[in-house]
Structures are given as C-alpha cells and as structure tokens.
C-alpha cells in the first residue's frame, strides 16, 4: 500500500458525505446503497464512521459529472478515467467525482428494476433466455399488450421468473397524474401523439398525457427511462432501441452483433435500419459503482494506489463479486486510522426477573423458510395478456376477503407482524392484514389482502415499520426487505444491503430512536438503523436485554404503538415505556384482548 505524502488523512473519525447529484443509469436508491456499502467496507476495518448529510459542508462531496465538470481535471468520455477523488482536506479535498459518460451499473449490465410479475421487484438479468433465444434488453415478445418485460434469472424458460420493465404503458413518474400510465394516442396542442414526446419542453424530458386529450384534461406524467435500451455512440446516442427493427430485410427483436466484425451489440433506433440508418450500441456490462466508489473513497481517506494487483486500491478496474478489500488495503487504511476498536468487554449479565404472568412458553419464532408462492399482480407470466395498468394501491381498492372464523383478527393466535402505520395499527398474518383504530367499541377492520395493497410482498412477513418523516414502509421477510413509498417499491433487497451480516436470519422488529433513526431487532440482538442511508451502524450492535431489561429474549415481533414499545412472544406482549432514559416493562398483556379489545369469550 501507499499513502499520500505526509500521510494526508482526516483528523476526525465521524466522516460525513453528501451525494450532490445522481446518474440516470441507476435508480437513486441503488446509488445511495452502492455508496453506503462502499463506505461500510472501510468503516468495518477502522474506527471511522460515515454519515450521510444533505449539505455542501460534508467532508466528502460525491458528484457525477462529464468532461469539464468544475475542477481542474476534466473527464475523458466513456471508459478510460472512470472517476477521481481528492485526498483528505478542506473544500474540494476529499471529494469524489464519477464520470457520467460511463455506464454505471453493479458490474453485470444495466440495472433495470421490475414491477409486478412474479419476481418481487428483482432486477432484470441480462442476457436472459426466452423460448431458446437470448435477450440483452427488455422485450415485448410473447405478449400481445406491448408491455416490455424481462426475466430476472438467466433463463426464463427454466425458471419462469419475470417482471415488467419501466414503461410508460405501465406507469409514469412525477407529473400530476398520480403515476397513471400514458394514454396513446393523446392530443397535445391539437396534434395526435402515439409515443412519449419532448415537445413543449425545453429540458428534453420525455412526457405523455395520461388521458386522451391533454389540451382538455391537462393530466400528464414523465415517461420512465429505459436504461436497458438507451443506446450509446452510433448516430443516435441517448435514443431508445426500437424493437423489432429491420436490418438487411430481417427482423430483430433484440440487440444484435450482425453486420459487425467486433461482436459488439447494436440496435436500430427506428423500426427500419435499412431505410433510416439510425443506430447505436446497446449497453455493455457497465462499471460497478460500488467497486469504483470503494476505490475512490480509499483515495478520499488518504490511500494512494497499491502495487498489489489483487488490492482494491490497485489502479485498474476489475469486476469481482468476492470481498473487495485485500489485506493490503486493510493494512493501508489501518496505517492511517488504526484498527476498529473491539467492543468493550461486558460485565456478566444478571438475569432480570421475568413477569410471572402470562406464561413464557413460546414457539422458537416464525419459520425462516417461507412459502414459495408469491401473489402476482398482473399476468402469471409472459406470454399472454397482462394488466391494462398496474393495480392501484390504496384502501379504496383493498379487497375484503369473505369472512370465516380464522379471518376474525380476534381468532388469530400469533400475528406475523404488527406495525403502527399512520394512526392505525396494522396486523399481518398469512397474506392478510387488519387495521385497528383505538377507541371505545373499536374492532379490527378486515381482513384485506396484502397483495392488493402491496403487490410485491410475500405472504409471510417478519416485521413492518413506517418511517414517519418520509412515510416509507419497510417490510421484512426472511433475509429480504421491501421499501414502499406510496405505491412504488424498492426491493426485494437482501439484509446485507442494510449492513446486516449473513448471520442475521430475519428482522423481527423495529422501534423509533430519534429523528430518522430506528432500532432494528433480530432475536436477542439490535442495531441502530439510519433510515435515509438505509444502513445499520454495525458498531451499534447490542443485546436486547441490555437496553430493555425484563423483556423476553425470544420475541418474534417488536413494534411501536402510541409511543410505547411492544415486545411480542407467543400471544403476549411486554410493553416498555421510557422514563428518564430508563426502559421499563410497565405492562404485560394479550395482543387480542388488551390491544385489540377483543371480547374474552
């Protein structure tokens, strides 16, 4: 390893960073996550912590730019120099800049998150096999409704997993139409449009009307970008592939290397290359933003290039899915900042007397293997007709299931998960949920189908929480998490994306812990979680009984309700209230009788 002359380094350990702008290549949440994971590599082996802030006085300002982008070091277009970073110090020092002429991915092709289908929002897998053919972009093949879709595994024919790609026929973004899909054709300034347009705008954004007549209804949305089929180079850079297209009299419904000697994939950007001669290169594997960021952050922390070819700080990009940090990187960063301190030795814990009633006999917790079936919003798979539009989420469309005794919340022994959402208590069980508002004579409403309101979710949930500021809903099931903002979902993501190790089999609950912070629980352990960064602080790991003496050690759900913490075990809860920094159990009761006010018959 090498460090900069004078061992340039930060002289405080709580480093802040600001993501000043974004690349269009990846969803913002994926970019946020890539940077958070890149910082986590370095914090895992040093005393450093990294906190995301939202102002330019952050230590490390992260910026995407092209060519001359405001410093003395212009970028060089696609490939070559991918990014650069400045050694630690004030002002621009310590900042990291990423060349947005690159295709940013996670190293394995464009990241296209899907919606609906049966893949729980997983990203497309490019290339994928469908009916024996290879596809390197989303396709409408096999469908009659024109909706682009992709396989989320390498082979649709064998795995049958798919989702719908971003498409204006499925939804729009922003605008004023609540995300409704485009209506084609539509009238704008007396003219008919059968595709998204930039007309009427000076910023180049593609938009459409969501009714047949924009002039009359004034309802519109922006068309989602399609990273998988946005071409580079050629003579139509930035335009979309048009599938199918005709080349030398033959029809192509995916990118092709025909007519080229170098094997590079290309497509036409009109339906007929032979007549229009408009084309561009299809996206390649791209560069892993996570790996490049991890390297750049090494520089921003004071590491120069390493001469060890396997090291992250070696000056050549190399995609790897293994652990990025080499011993040489660890030695280098520890030379500057020292090792991560060991957790303080804990005094032997004395067992806190448990409340005597009710009994503490309980199941060991929910099974970690979940039913394989997933509710599908939309078609069960391409080909065939699909949704005319995404199912709309919201109370008004929630389907009430015909009532049977088991569908009465008062007959549910143990709920999968409980959460306060808005001002109501939501109770989840086996693909269904109930809503409860406290009040004299109140009864839980429902059951409703989870699939109607949150179509991406599995039937079995371990825990749920709402972050009040952003109104984001976090749903945990096994080793996965889904984050809903209104009707749009990010996920599923693995728990390790949140900084939780492979030894964490599930998240069993969450409690608020200050502005934008939560405590996440898993069995006997808990972590502090930053909602904006969507990362746990790995050093905040603690034992539940240290912070909440007197609660059972094998709770299967932890939730907050009316500003108090509830620890569920079997049919019972232990309620904890905080007084002057002390967490004390102040009530033990039954979920059904004491919270839901069910009759004791």
């Amino acid at each position: 390893f090498q460090t900069f002359e004078g061992d340039l380094k930060w002289h405080h350990h709580n480093i802040t960073y600001w993501i000043q702008n974004y690349s269009e290549d990846l969803p913002r949440a994926v970019i946020d996550d890539a940077f958070a994971r890149a910082f986590a590599l370095w914090s895992a082996v040093t005393p450093l912590t990294f906190t995301r802030v939202y102002s330019r006085d952050a230590d490390i300002v992260i910026q995407f730019g092209v060519a001359e982008h405001g410093d003395g070091y212009p970028f060089d277009g696609k490939d070559g120099l991918l990014a650069h970073a400045f050694p630690p110090g004030p002002g621009i020092q310590g900042d990291a800049h990423f060349d947005d002429d690159e295709l940013w991915s996670l190293g394995k092709g464009v990241v296209v998150p899907t919606r609906f289908g049966n893949a729980d929002g997983a990203a497309c897998h490019f290339p994928f096999i469908f009916e024996g053919r290879s596809y390197s972009a989303c396709t409408t093949d096999g469908r009659s409704d024109g909706l682009p879709w992709c396989s989320t595994t390498a082979n649709y024919d064998t795995d049958d997993r798919f989702g719908f790609c971003p498409s204006e026929r499925l939804y729009t973004q922003d605008g004023n139409a609540d995300g409704k899909p485009c209506q084609f054709p539509f009238i704008f300034q007396g003219q008919s449009y059968s595709a998204c347009t930039t007309d009427g705008r000076s910023d180049g954004y593609r938009w459409c009307a969501t009714t047949a007549n924009y002039d009359r209804d004034k309802l519109f949305g922006f068309c989602p970008t399609r990273a998988d089929s946005t071409v580079m180079g050629g003579n139509s850079a930035g335009e979309l592939c048009v599938f199918p297209f005709t080349f030398l009299g033959k029809e192509y419904s995916t990118c092709t290397s025909e007519g080229r000697g170098d094997g590079r994939l290309w497509c036409a950007t009109t339906s007929n290359f032979d007549s229009d001669k408009k084309w561009g290169f299809c996206p390649d594997q791209g560069y892993s933003l996570f790996l490049v960021a991890a390297h750049e952050f090494g520089h921003a922390l004071g590491l120069d290039h390493s001469s060890v070819p396997e090291a992250l700080m070696y000056p050549m990009y190399r995609f790897t899915e293994g652990p990025p940090l080499h011993k040489d990187d660890v030695n280098g960063i520890r030379h500057l900042y020292g090792p991560r301190p060991e957790p303080e030795p804990r005094p032997p814990t004395t067992t806190t007397p448990q409340p005597t009633a009710p009994p503490t006999v309980c199941p060991t917790g929910p099974p970690t293997v979940h039913p394989s079936e997933r509710p599908t919003a939309g078609p069960t798979g391409p080909p065939s007709a699909g949704p005319t539009g995404p199912p709309t989420a919201g109370p008004s469309t929630a389907t009430t299931v015909p009532l049977s005794p088991v569908d009465d919340a008062c007959n549910v022994n143990i709920f999968d998960a409980i959460a306060e959402i808005g001002n109501q208590l939501y109770l989840f069980k086996d693909g269904k949920y109930w809503r409860f508002s406290e009040g004299r004579g109140s009864r839980p409403q429902g059951p409703f189908l989870i699939a109607d309101k949150w179509p991406a979710l599995p039937r079995k949930l371990d825990s749920v929480f709402e972050e009040r500021l952003s109104k984001k809903l976090f749903f945990f099931s096994g080793r996965q998490v889904w984050v809903y903002t209104g009707a749009s979902v990010l996920g599923p993501r693995r728990l390790d994306k949140l900084g939780l190790g492979a030894d964490v089999a599930q998240v069993t609950g969450a409690l608020r812990s200050g502005r934008g912070k939560m405590l996440l629980f898993s069995g006997r352990r808990l972590w502090r979680f930053d909602v904006k960064a969507q990362m746990v602080d790995p050093r905040s790991a603690s034992e539940v009984d240290r912070m909440f003496p007197g609660v059972p050690l094998d709770t299967h759900d932890v939730f907050q309700y009316r500003e108090k913490a509830y620890f569920c075990q079997d049919r019972f809860y232990w309620r904890v209230s905080s007084r002057s920094e002390l967490n004390q159990v102040d009530q033990v009761g039954y979920v059904t009788y004491d919270i839901l006010q069910c009759p004791e018959d």
């Epitope: 900069f4 003395g72 070091y73 060089d76 490939d79 070559g80 400045f86 002002g91 520089h299 000056p315």
Partner: antibody, heavy 123, light 107 residues
C-alpha cells in the same frame, strides 16, 4: 532515468504545417497524461494541449481546431500536429509529463520537461 | 479562466537574504498550485507541488505555503544558483494557467 526529447521544430511560413515529436523513456509512458506547453520569446509559459492515457484530448482556445495532439504508446512518443500556423504560434514548444497519473488528484505539477524545440512562423 | 498574478515582477536581493515571492489567484484554487524555476535557455523545473510539497531533489531552503487564493514561495537563504524566473501555475479549475513570472536577480 526519465527523458523527454522533442524534435520537429523549424521555420515555417504562415498557414503552413509542422509536426512535433516527443520521445519518452524511463517511465511507463502509457499511464501518464502528457502535455505540450509553449513559451514565446521573452514571454511566460502557456499550455497548449494535453492527452490522457485513454487518448482523450484537450486544447487551449488559441490552438483549437488547428493543432492535434496524439500519442503512440507502442513507440513511447507524443506528437503535436500544427496546421494553419500563425506568427503568434512562434515559440519554444516543450513536452511535459504529469507527476501523477490516474484517479487521485492533487495538483502534482509537471515533474519532467523536454529541452524544447523552437518553432518560428515567419514569411 | 483563472488569472494568476505574481508579485513583484522583479525582486532584487543579495545572496544569503530571504526571498518571498507571491502568487494570487482570481478565485479559490484550494491547494492546486505548483511553482517552477526557469533559467535562461533551459526548460522549467518543478520546485513545489500541491502548494507546499517540495519536489524530488529540491533543497530544503525552498518552501511553499498558502491555499485558496494567496500563495507564497519562500527561499530562506539565497544561493547564487537561485537567480532565475519563477512561475506559479494553478489547476484548481480548468484550464490550467500560469502566472506571468517573477524575475529574481542579484542585487
């Protein structure tokens, strides 16, 4: 030992062309940004052009569209093709090597310079 | 473009004296500044980079300081071989620019 050796200068008429070369040795040429800097007689230094290892080029406004920088990494040689020469292009032309390379940035300066080659544009 | 202004244009000092050369940028350039020495008929030679780091082989009597817009090159005790023209150069913003130079002559 790092060495940079320019050649190709001389007397040329306005509107004429010249091609300067800079032969490099003693370092991994292909990894470094390489620059041309000129100095008019009795005047200060003025940057002319730079080429990155990837081949990306940048030019001073005064020479844009007339000069072309290039490199041949297999021959460890930097070039400057000068067309449509003007009297004000008269100068000693130096090639220079960046002290640092790659993606970490401090202003590290030009740590090695050639001895310079004189270009005189006159009728 | 960022303008680099050096002062004084000429500095006359005797051997053994302390020389202080100034360079001012028209806007902040952080510490992205280099100093060069040029003797007649020779190519420039890098003295200081990143405002304060001595280049390889440069004697300890040369030092650089400053950040933002104001920078100083100091020669603590002048030797006969130090008489030359000194240039500052910025790379805090594109394009790079040089100062017009300070001539250091024997008094």
């Amino acid at each position: 030992e790092v060495q940079l050796l320019e050649s190709g200068g001389g007397l040329v008429q306005p509107g004429g062309s010249l091609r300067l070369s800079c032969a490099a040795s003693g370092f991994t040429f292909s990894q470094y940004d390489m620059w041309w800097v000129r100095q008019a007689p009795g005047k200060g230094l003025e940057w002319v052009s730079v080429i990155y290892p990837s081949g990306t080029t940048f030019y001073a406004d005064s020479v844009k569209g007339r000069f072309t920088i290039s490199r041949d990494n297999s021959k460890n040689t930097l070039y400057l093709q000068m067309n449509s020469l003007r009297a004000e292009d008269t100068a000693v032309y130096y090639c220079a090597k960046d002290r640092a390379y790659g993606d970490y940035v401090g202003w590290n300066g030009f740590d090695y310079w050639g001895q310079g080659t004189l270009v005189t544009v006159s009728s | 473009d960022i303008q680099m202004t050096q002062s004084p244009a000429t500095l006359s000092l005797s051997p053994g004296e302390r020389a202080t050369l100034s360079c001012r940028a028209s806007q902040s350039i952080s510490s992205f500044l280099a100093w060069y020495q040029q003797k007649p008929g020779q190519a420039p030679r890098l003295l200081i980079y990143d405002a304060s780091y001595r280049a390889t082989g440069i004697p300890a009597r040369f030092s650089g300081s400053g950040s933002g817009t104001d920078f100083t090159l100091t020669i603590s005790s002048l030797e006969p071989e130090d008489y030359a023209v000194y240039y500052c150069q910025q790379r805090g913003n594109w394009p790079i620019t040089f100062g017009q130079g300070t001539r250091l002559e024997i008094k």
